[in-house]
């Protein structure tokens, strides 16, 4: 299987992980976290990094702590820097994580999913049009 295909699988897997965590929003610490939305073009990877850095945490209540902690840790899996597309070129002009609106876990996860969907769409489009961006 090609690296590009594996990359797509990993991105879709992240969406599934977000979906799983959405089942447990009541078991997450109700902390407000930077949640990028309407991310400008070429800042997607920067925003992705902000989502990964956010301190999403299990509230350690109930019996779902294990699956929550495993899922959060898998959400933070770092893609290789070569996959970051134009991330390096445009990083200086992208908003800092702190500048994004802070949202509770439910909205944080919804916005993360939205960004992942956008990135997958862009990735597919760039492949269709022969671009080297991934």
């Amino acid at each position: 299987m090609q690296g590009q295909d594996r990359h797509m699988i990993r991105m879709r897997q992240l969406i599934d992980i977000v979906d799983q965590l959405k089942n447990y929003v009541n078991d997450l610490v109700p902390e407000f976290l930077p949640a990028p939305e309407d991310v400008e073009t070429n800042c997607e990877w920067s925003a992705f990094s902000c989502f990964q850095k956010a301190q999403l945490k299990s509230a350690n209540t109930g019996n779902n702590e294990r699956i929550i902690n495993v899922s959060i840790k898998k959400l933070k899996r770092k893609p290789p820097s070569t996959n970051a597309g134009r991330r390096q070129k445009h990083r200086l002009t992208c908003p800092s994580c702190d500048s994004y609106e802070k949202k509770p876990p439910k909205e944080f996860l919804e916005r993360f999913k939205s960004l992942l969907q956008k990135m997958i769409h862009q990735h597919l489009s760039s492949r269709t049009h022969g671009s080297e961006d991934s």
Partner: antibody, heavy 126, light 106 residues
Framework: QVQLVESGGGVVQPGRSLRLSCAAS????????MHWVRQAPGKGLEWVAF????????YYADSVKGRFTISRDNSKNTLYLQMNSLRAEDTAVYYC???????????????????WGQGTTVTVSS | EIVLTQSPGTLSLSPGERATLSCRAS???????LAWYQQKPGQAPRLLIY???SRATGIPDRFSGSGSGTDFTLTISRLEPEDFAVYYC???????FGQGTKVEIK
Amino acid sequence: QVQLVESGGGVVQPGRSLRLSCAASGFTFSSYGMHWVRQAPGKGLEWVAFIWYDGSDKYYADSVKGRFTISRDNSKNTLYLQMNSLRAEDTAVYYCARDGDSSDWYGDYYFGMDVWGQGTTVTVSS
Amino acid sequence: EIVLTQSPGTLSLSPGERATLSCRASQSVSSSYLAWYQQKPGQAPRLLIYGAASRATGIPDRFSGSGSGTDFTLTISRLEPEDFAVYYCQQYGSWTFGQGTKVEIK
């Protein structure tokens, strides 16, 4: 080929200790989380413990928490299960299993246990 | 913690017949987190299906998985003699197993 081989099982008295080992070969051991799963005679599968690929996190079933310790030595491609304060209900075949989700972004991506050892039998009896 | 309930406990069928095994979760499970295993007597389990519907490497296409939310199904389209075994579903991440369904020869 990809292989897991458990050892260290045996007959032990209640309250005593035992250490199981699982030797891995045929794959990059340090890129995979690892599990211990057990099966009591005539019963179903029971997950016991999991360790992250780099040993940074460990998780345990409630039935063994505080008594069992999972560890790994990536330089030796070996997984361990230290079992203390053993009870009769710990009698089972113990399997080590590889977690199918590699730490490598381009690696395996299976949310499941994709490689299993043949098992080692632990009998706790006085 | 999530509980996975498999049904039926035992399925008595003949070779060539279709087997339908059910796995019901006590709370919603993302499809990616649901796996199925096969275990034959005296052998270690084998991963059959991951992500609720994807066959693991080397698994024949007579095995298929489906479902979402709380209801998942493993289907064996035409039972071969080597398919008579115990089947377990599992939620990834909590690593909870169902109690198993035994598929035996009628």
